[in-house]
């Protein structure tokens, strides 16, 4: 079988949801000594980056300027060490936001509830979309989807203090083109009678996986890279 290098990791820097006309940055983390990285969009070559010097860094950043609906979709990357190519990375879905319209988000029975109450979010947008998405701030990968012609319901069931936080919704024109975000709705969930307001609010840290962890080599990494290179030669 044809030999390949391990697959790289593809990530979006800061977020995979990019407002139209803004710049998206995708990172492809491969290996020290990779001389070329290729970014593929919907299966076709989209961009090429060559790190300088290749042995000093374990990945590259691809900048996608002026984001629009034609650049939204599935991205993957591969890299090359010498003549040897890696496997393809997993697919990354890049979404363009701030398309067309702004939905409205409401919550029933209201934004202040007690732990155990049933809560439903409603996202309304009367144009060109049938899929709606609900996101909690700081949890952008945990997207809830719901369907409706003009309005979608997001039943949360009996809530706990873990549901506290700020929510926004989007209408989706297709899987990769979303509306402007709604104004945020802050859900406040008070605990049981005996521990009311003792539970801390969820911290809204940015999504930890939405960062590019590209590193420059140290002496130890250089030794490992050299060892890896020697091993590759032996394999050849």
């Amino acid at each position: 079988p044809k030999q390949t290098l391990p697959k790289p990791i593809i990530r979006a820097e800061s977020t995979y949801m990019v407002p139209k006309e803004k710049q998206a940055t995708l990172c492809c983390q491969g290996s020290y000594g990779a001389v070329e990285y290729q970014l593929h969009f919907e299966g076709s070559l989209f961009a090429v980056e060559r790190p300088k010097p290749p042995e000093r860094i374990n990945g590259v950043k691809f900048h996608i300027p002026d984001m629009n609906s034609r650049k939204a979709g599935r991205y993957s990357c591969i890299y090359r060490v010498g003549e040897l190519w890696s496997e393809r990375s997993d697919l990354l879905d890049l979404v363009v936001t701030e398309m067309y319209d702004t939905p409205t988000l409401s919550v029933h029975p209201g934004p202040e509830v007690t732990s155990g109450e049933k809560v439903t979010f409603y996202c309304r947008l009367d144009t060109a979309t049938s899929m709606f998405l609900l996101l909690k701030e700081g949890r952008s990968r945990d997207v809830q989807r719901s369907y409706g012609k003009v309005q979608a319901e997001f039943p949360m069931g009996p809530v706990t203090t873990a549901h506290r936080g700020s929510y926004r919704c989007f209408g989706s024109y297709n899987n990769y083109a979303w509306s402007f975000p709604s104004e945020p709705v802050k859900l406040l969930v008070t605990g049981d009678i005996e521990n009311t307001s003792l539970a801390p609010t969820d911290p809204t840290f940015p999504d930890s996986w939405d960062t590019c962890l590209l590193t420059r080599e140290t002496g130890l990494q250089k030794d490992l890279a050299l060892w890896d290179h020697t091993a590759q030669n032996l394999l050849r």
Epitope: K20, E21, D66
Partner: antibody, heavy 120, light 107 residues
Framework: QVQLVQSGAEVKKPGSSVKVSCKAS????????INWGRQAPGQGLEWIGE????????YYNEKFKAKATITADKSTSTAYMELSSLRSEDTAVYFC?????????????WGQGTTVTVSS | DIQMTQSPSSLSASVGDRVTITCRAS??????LNWYQQKPGKAPKLLIY???RLHSGVPSRFSGSGSGTDFTFTISSLQPEDIATYFC?????????FGGGTKVEIK
Amino acid sequence: QVQLVQSGAEVKKPGSSVKVSCKASGYTFTDYVINWGRQAPGQGLEWIGEIYPGSGTNYYNEKFKAKATITADKSTSTAYMELSSLRSEDTAVYFCARRGRYGLYAMDYWGQGTTVTVSS
Amino acid sequence: DIQMTQSPSSLSASVGDRVTITCRASQDISNYLNWYQQKPGKAPKLLIYYTSRLHSGVPSRFSGSGSGTDFTFTISSLQPEDIATYFCQQGNTRPWTFGGGTKVEIK
């Protein structure tokens, strides 16, 4: 920079049709809604309808549903509005406008206007 | 359809004056209210969107306020180049509708 350039003035006979064009440049045509409106002499503005060029989805003012047909050609970044069964009261300046980047239903760039005169 | 009633229909003021125009919606439109300026023979230009947000490149002497059904547009210090007709437009519900316009002239 963003520009919407409309076709030239038209003089038409009652009962005939006219097709007005609006060529967009300076932005991604499919990513913004194009609106059409009109302004009769000495009158205010009336909204006729709009198109989402990416999907071709239309919304019309009920008043103009039988009068106007709005289309878009993605390959040339051009929106069109055809007006049928013209009458003298259709004499007006017709505008195209891009619904703005804010997502808040405001029209941030406008064409220069096309005067349509209906006269026998 | 939502009716937009603008007043006054015309006004005359001196350079440097504060000018105020009001717009009333026939039903609640939240903050989805926009203001445009139109000079004779020209297309309208967006000045203010979502009640009070200034469109890029628009001088800060223009401002807007209000909510629900009652809205106000203000020019803090009228300049000669502000001679135009001003329209409000609701963006809450289709069909989008405009006020009848206010013609601003210099005394």
